[in-house]
Interface confidence: low
């Protein structure tokens, strides 16, 4: 038998002394069913799509396939076993892996990126692993909106 | 009552306030009008309960299947705020309210605290150490 009595806990955060938190706060505004973290919004799909389909679905919501700033950006889901399409593709023109906004992949982000097949797209696991897969394969995907 | 089914398969959803900056502490996440602390450390059920209280929040609760699926997709197995005094007692929330959803392995008299585990709720030994997460509804 457990020694638990009836508990009654309804705590509240204390972000500051007696701060009245407005329900219409405009600081960070995410869409429903998106995750807010460090003032970014993420949509973590449960549906599997090709890389192009994923890119278009994100774009339709004024977001883009995940562009990582660092490998701990998604540390809130670092235990996930899933791989997700991210917004990284190889540019023949620039002979480099580029994010959707045109910036180059940092060599420190994925040390193994030189072994990636340049015809493939990149799937990422939030514990920091990345692998290249045919862009026609279907994976879950993550969209990102930067709010500030 | 069956869990409410909601489709979370595409990002095509209406806009709402996520109340991230002003409403959740740094390093917590927001999802569907709740704040979540994503724990990395392991604790017993009761230690987890107290740890969340010390963070001015409550041990993770699961309100519907959509939430359960979302959390299970990004989190490891973790304690939730549901327990029973013995296998002869009903499952209750940390407020002592009846918990109406199915918990697997409930017939085992040793397992009196509940765990979220890959899209299902399961009973476990309250004294075992598991990851915990905290939640506050906005």
């Amino acid at each position: 038998k457990n020694s638990f009595t009836k508990l009654s806990i309804e705590p509240a955060f204390t972000p500051g002394p007696n701060i009245e938190l407005q329900k219409d706060s405009d600081c960070c505004s995410c869409q429903e069913k998106w995750v807010g973290y460090r003032c970014n919004c993420y949509f973590i799909s449960s549906e599997q799509k090709t890389w192009n389909e994923s890119r278009h679905l994100c774009a339709s919501q004024k977001s883009s396939l995940l562009q990582l700033q660092n490998t701990d950006e998604l540390d809130f889901m670092s235990s996930s076993q899933q791989f997700y399409w991210i917004g990284l593709s190889y540019s023949e023109e620039h002979t480099a892996w580029l994010w959707e906004n045109g910036s180059a992949l940092s060599q420190y982000l994925f040390p193994s990126f030189e072994t990636f097949n340049t015809k493939n797209c990149i799937a990422y696991n939030p514990n920091g692993n990345a692998l290249d897969e045919s862009c026609e394969d279907k994976n879950r995907y993550i969209c990102k909106q930067q709010l500030i | 009552i069956p869990f409410l089914e909601q489709n979370n398969s595409s990002p095509n959803t209406r806009t709402q306030k996520a109340r991230h900056c002003g409403h959740c502490p740094e390093e917590w996440i927001t999802y569907s009008n709740s704040c979540y602390y994503i724990g990395k450390e392991r604790r017993t059920w009761e230690e987890s309960l107290l740890a969340c209280t010390s963070k001015n929040s409550s041990l993770l609760s699961i309100d519907n299947e959509e939430e359960m699926k979302f959390l299970a997709s990004i989190l490891p197995s973790s304690w939730i705020g549901v327990f029973r005094n013995s296998s002869h007692h009903p499952w209750v929330t940390i407020n002592g309210l009846a918990f109406k959803h199915k918990i697997k392995d409930s017939d085992n008299a040793e397992l009196n605290c509940a765990v979220l585990q890959v899209n299902r709720l399961k009973s476990a030994q309250c004294g075992s150490s598991m990851i915990y997460h905290c939640k506050h509804k906005l």
């Epitope: 009654s8 806990i9 309804e10 705590p11 509240a12 955060f13 204390t14 972000p15 500051g16 007696n18 701060i19 009245e20 938190l21 329900k23 | 009552i1 409410l4 709402q16 409403h23 009008n33 001015n56 409550s58 609760s61 519907n64 929330t93 407020n95 309210l97 109406k100 509804k137 906005l138």
Partner: antibody, heavy 119, light 107 residues
Framework: EVQLVESGGGLVQRGGSLRLSCAAS????????MNWIRQAPGKGLEWVAH????????YYADSVKGRFTISRDNAKNSLSLQMNSLRDEDTAVYYC????????????WGQGTMVTVSS | EIVLTQSPATLSLSPGERATLSCRAS??????LAWYQQKPGQAPRLLIY???NRATGIPARFSGSGSGTDFTLTISSLEPEDFAVYYC?????????FGPGTKVDIK
């Protein structure tokens, strides 16, 4: 015995102010969110304001926003409602009520205190 | 804001009869709906929370059902003390709303 007792009601002029209090006993007041709910004579119930256990989360009905202020003193097991710029339509019995986290409902109510706004 | 509509406005029944009260939400509230009973000169009393869970001390003749937008409170066999006004209530984004009430009176 779990109890909520309101006080401070009375007759007030239109545009005037009044402060209602609610004394809680028989439970851990500091662990519960609290609310004010009102009922105009012969009418239904209207939720007025909500305050979380630590006073960080405060919400108001649109009809009272900017005029009413909810507050609490956990050391004194006390809930308050400061009502300013009172209008005729604020005439009602005002109840304080406890809501338990997770049930989205008011499970403990006080007996109410009557506020009459006169012109 | 979610609007709750209750029907009928008045229900005239005799003791021992079954009472069925309806509450409809203008949009889905999933199962976040409560029912209260109020007698003249008294504060409301919580009967049902989360659409179907009886509050502490509420007799088994009271039951709640429904989810989404349509909810029902059933009193299986009316006792003399059950004649009162019944309100439904929901919470969405920390805005609580009540229905206008159904009065159950003696026929």
């Amino acid at each position: 015995e779990v109890q909520l007792v309101e006080s401070g009601g009375g007759l007030v002029q239109r545009g005037g102010s009044l402060r209602l209090s609610c004394a809680a006993s028989g439970f851990t007041f500091s662990s519960n969110s609290m609310n004010w709910i009102r009922q105009a004579p012969g009418k239904g119930l209207e939720w007025v304001a909500h305050i979380s256990s630590g006073s960080s989360f405060i919400y108001y009905a649109d009809s009272v926003k900017g005029r009413f202020t909810i507050s609490r003193d956990n050391a004194k097991n006390s809930l308050s409602l400061q009502m300013n710029s009172l209008r005729d339509e604020d005439t009602a019995v005002y109840y304080c009520a406890r809501d338990d986290w997770g049930i989205d409902a008011f499970n403990i109510w006080g007996q109410g205190t009557m506020v009459t706004v006169s012109s | 804001e979610i609007v709750l509509t209750q029907s009928p406005a008045t229900l005239s029944l005799s003791p021992g009869e079954r009472a069925t009260l309806s509450c409809r939400a203008s949009q889905s509230v999933s199962s976040s709906l409560a029912w209260y009973q109020q007698k003249p000169g008294q504060a409301p009393r919580l009967l049902i929370y989360d659409a179907s869970n009886r509050a502490t001390g509420i007799p088994a003749r009271f039951s709640g059902s429904g989810s989404g937008t349509d909810f029902t409170l059933t009193i299986s066999s009316l006792e003399p003390e059950d004649f009162a006004v019944y309100y439904c209530q929901q919470r969405s984004n920390w805005i609580f709303t009540f229905g206008p009430g159904t009065k159950v009176d003696i026929k």
